[in-house]
């Protein structure tokens, strides 16, 4: 007995579209092997149709695809503009054709409905509309108009020319009589529900003499689309309910059991408390077409999403929708990140970015995700040089470590900093990272003075006190700029007083400026480092005046100012604001400044949010 | 909620046939499944046939022990299914479950599928 399973009878219509799902038991060597359709010859053979290697016949050009959902055990092949050609003897089977890793499946296409027994048939999606034409003749032109409903053997009235509507569709329904050039009244029925659908009798005139005619009304649950994300990754849901409900209320639910759609989040400000920071509405088109991207994927994630329009913002019987079957691959290859970072207030931390390691080149970007309206993403920096305003000197993105993770570090924290981060690229869009970071209590392990001022044509020597518990770190000091922060030389003076019970390990490090230049003036950092990967951070802003007095200046930490929570930028600075990630598939820029750069389709980066891998300042 | 009725179940002599009906009350919609499911004696409870809609498109599972001898099918006016059972052997006895679901789209030998049951109709084959 084969150990594949799937339909035995498969029955449609011309037209029509199936869906095949096969399944297999998922050891690993069947996870991987090539999945095939075929279709039994009168001689015993199976002519391949599709395979998972990317085989398509002639026949299924444009209208199948075979998809393999390893981590469920199951391909699914789906065939669409069925015709009764294609009704016949199939296999779904693992590994080659002849060698009885198959299932037998047999796909019978029929007719299509049309006008079968003068009865027209309407097939209209849920929550759509339908219009319902019914023809009569001049002798009835000024008689009563009417439509009812076959309710088991009882015609039921759904409206009149007199102004009668059956209390099941009020507020949905109108009869419109045609100009008098047309023998012709239509019924406009909205917002469909499953239950108006069967049969029709649209009538004008009441005796033997009316006019007659059958309807018969399918209302379609629309097929669900199967999307296939890696566990932390991003999936995006992308809605198109048509200019009709343009203005109306958009919602996105995941289906639990039985009819039941708990909202996920609406264009009415809900959002469900599991996807906190790590989803965004993106505004609707004129279209009224709308997007939702998830990031951070978890297991429990997996389900039955429906996007729909309706005013209260969640799903109601004729709401227009449409559906996804979200599976969700633990065969990642998507790596393990921290989903929380902790920093203390005046500290920093150092977030590990993970992205798409072929597409070294792609541009990276950090946003922080606001949780107001819809959410939105507002850029904060990326790697060709651009740093918001409000962060300069303190946020930086470095390409290292590479191969596959970049580095966000953000010192002088504060309360304010406390959130939700993502980390993007304007490559592969599956790759989207969503970060915490919290603000605990706590001292800044590294102590500077605070804002320093050094004198034209003279030195300068800033100290960096690193705690022993950093004794094997690399400790070094740069000069912070858009693209980075360039490493400068430092010098070691041996262990530092400024903790309390630290040994000799503790250090103090102090960097030079020799013959100050205006050039001097700027954002500072000392930092410690294990080769690529970065640790704390704290920065000290050193500006640079007139002499007043001769001899060179050595800044202790009793001389320091406090840091300023906010810089005060001079006038001639750039600002460049409201760089948000309001659609992801393209970065809302307003820029005073021609920027030309690609902003790419997407830009996904994913992290497990349901992981309790916590990340402390120090980075590792 | 839906609410199952089963009947048709009955004592018969190996050979003979059955047929048996689920009864849907409110609303199976324009996509679902019904299943029929069955413990024998002594025995776990086990998959035995299938069928899933959607809209007009229709898809029958059968267990491998019934295939070519159990039909399932679905009348849609009276939200009825139906598991016609012919040449019944001693090994079918067993209370025969139905099962339905408005929406499922898991595999359909799997019980934990099923959002709404019967309460079984017991068929008895002697031999």
């Known amino acids: 007995k084969s150990p594949i399973f799937g339909p035995e009878e498969v029955n449609s219509v011309e037209g029509n579209s199936v869906s095949i799902t096969c399944y297999y038991p998922p050891t690993s060597v069947n996870r991987h092997t090539r999945k095939y359709w075929c279709r039994q010859g009168a001689r015993g053979g199976c002519i391949t149709l599709i395979s998972s290697e990317g085989y398509v016949s002639s026949k299924y050009a444009g209208r199948a695809n075979l998809t393999n959902f390893p981590e469920n055990g199951t391909f699914v092949v789906n065939i669409a503009q069925l015709s009764q050609d294609d009704s016949g003897r199939y296999k779904c089977g693992l590994g080659i054709n002849s060698r009885g890793l198959s299932f037998d499946v047999s796909l019978e296409v029929s007719q299509g409905p049309g006008l079968l027994n003068d009865t027209k048939v309407y097939t209209v999606d849920l929550g759509r509309t339908v219009t319902i034409n019914c023809p009569f003749k001049t002798e009835n032109a000024q008689k009563r108009k009417s439509l009812y409903k076959q309710i088991g053997l009882y015609p039921v009235l759904v409206i009149d020319s007199s102004g009668y509507v059956n209390p099941n569709y009020t507020g949905r329904i109108r009869l419109d009589i045609q100009g008098t050039g047309q023998l012709l009244f239509s019924v406009v029925i909205n917002q469909l529900r499953l239950s108006d659908a069967g049969q029709y009798l649209c009538q004008a005139g009441d005796d033997s003499n009316s006019n007659k005619k059958n309807a018969d009304l399918q209302v379609l649950k629309p097929e669900p689309e199967l999307v296939y994300e890696d566990l932390r990754g991003s999936v995006t849901f992308h809605c198109a309910l048509g200019p009709e409900v343009a203005n109306v209320a958009k919602f996105l639910c995941r289906q639990s059991s039985g009819e039941n759609c708990d909202v996920v989040v609406n264009t009415l400000g809900k959002r469900a408390p599991a996807f906190e920071g790590r989803i965004l509405l993106n505004p609707q088109d004129k279209d009224g077409s709308f997007s939702v991207v998830i990031t951070g994927l978890r297991k429990e994630d997996a389900g039955r999403y429906l996007c729909g329009a309706h005013s209260d913002g969640q799903l109601q019987e004729g709401s227009p929708i449409q559906a996804w079957q979200l599976f969700v691959n633990e065969e990642s290859t998507i790596p393990r990140s921290p989903t929380v970072v902790k920093g203390v207030a005046g500290g920093s931390v150092a977030v590990l970015c993970p992205y798409n390691r072929k597409e070294s080149k792609s541009i990276k970007y950090w946003c922080l995700w606001e949780g107001a309206q819809n959410g939105r993403c507002p850029l904060l920096v990326d790697s060709e040089g651009w740093v918001k305003a409000q962060y300069e000197g303190r946020l930086s993105l470095l390409e290292e470590p590479g191969n596959g993770t970049f580095t966000v570090i953000l010192n002088q924290l504060t309360s304010r900093d406390a959130g939700f981060y993502w980390c993007l690229t304007n490559g592969d869009t599956l790759w989207r990272t969503t970060v915490e970071i919290k603000i605990i209590e706590g001292e800044p392990n590294l102590k500077v003075p605070g804002n320093v001022t050094a004198v034209l044509g003279e030195t300068l020597k800033v100290p960096c006190h690193f705690p022993c518990k950093f004794s094997s770190y690399e400790k070094y000091w740069c000069k912070w700029n858009n693209t980075g922060c360039q490493a400068l030389p430092s010098q070691d003076e041996g262990p530092s007083k400024a903790f309390v019970n630290c040994d000799e390990n503790s250090r103090l490090v102090s960097l030079t400026l020799n013959l100050v230049t205006r050039a001097d003036e700027g954002w500072y950092w000392c930092g410690v480092k294990q080769g690529h990967f970065y640790g704390e951070t704290a920065a000290v802003y050193v500006a640079v005046e007139e002499r007043k007095a001769a001899g060179s200046r050595d800044v202790s930490l009793a001389k320091a100012d406090a840091a300023p929570d906010e810089k005060v930028l001079d006038s001639g600075f750039r600002e460049i604001e409201n760089k948000a990630i309001q659609d992801p598939r393209l970065f809302a820029e307003e820029k005073a400044v021609a920027d030309t750069r690609d902003q790419a389709d997407g830009s996904r980066a994913s992290v497990d949010s349901g992981s309790s891998e916590e990340q402390g300042g120090s980075s590792r | 909620e839906v609410q199952l009725v089963e009947s048709g179940g009955g004592l018969v002599q190996a050979g003979d046939s059955l047929r048996l009906s689920c009864a849907a009350s409110?609303?199976?919609?324009?996509?679902?499944?019904m299943g029929w499911f069955r413990q024998g004696p002594g025995k776990e409870r086990e998959f035995v046939a299938a069928?899933?809609?959607?809209?007009?498109?229709?898809?029958?599972y059968y267990e491998d022990s019934v295939k070519g001898r159990f039909t399932i099918s679905r009348d849609n006016a009276k939200n009825t299914a139906y598991l016609q059972m012919n040449s019944l052997k001693p090994e079918d006895t067993a209370v025969y479950y139905c099962?339905?679901?408005?929406?499922?789209?898991?595999?359909?030998?799997?019980?934990?599928?099923?959002?709404?049951w019967g309460q079984g109709t017991l068929v008895t084959v002697s031999s």
């Open positions: 069928l899933m809609w959607r809209n007009t498109v229709t898809y029958k």
């Open positions: 409110g609303r199976t919609g324009s996509s679902g499944a």
């Open positions: 099962a339905a679901d408005p929406d499922t789209y898991g595999d359909p030998r799997n019980s934990g599928a099923y959002d709404y």
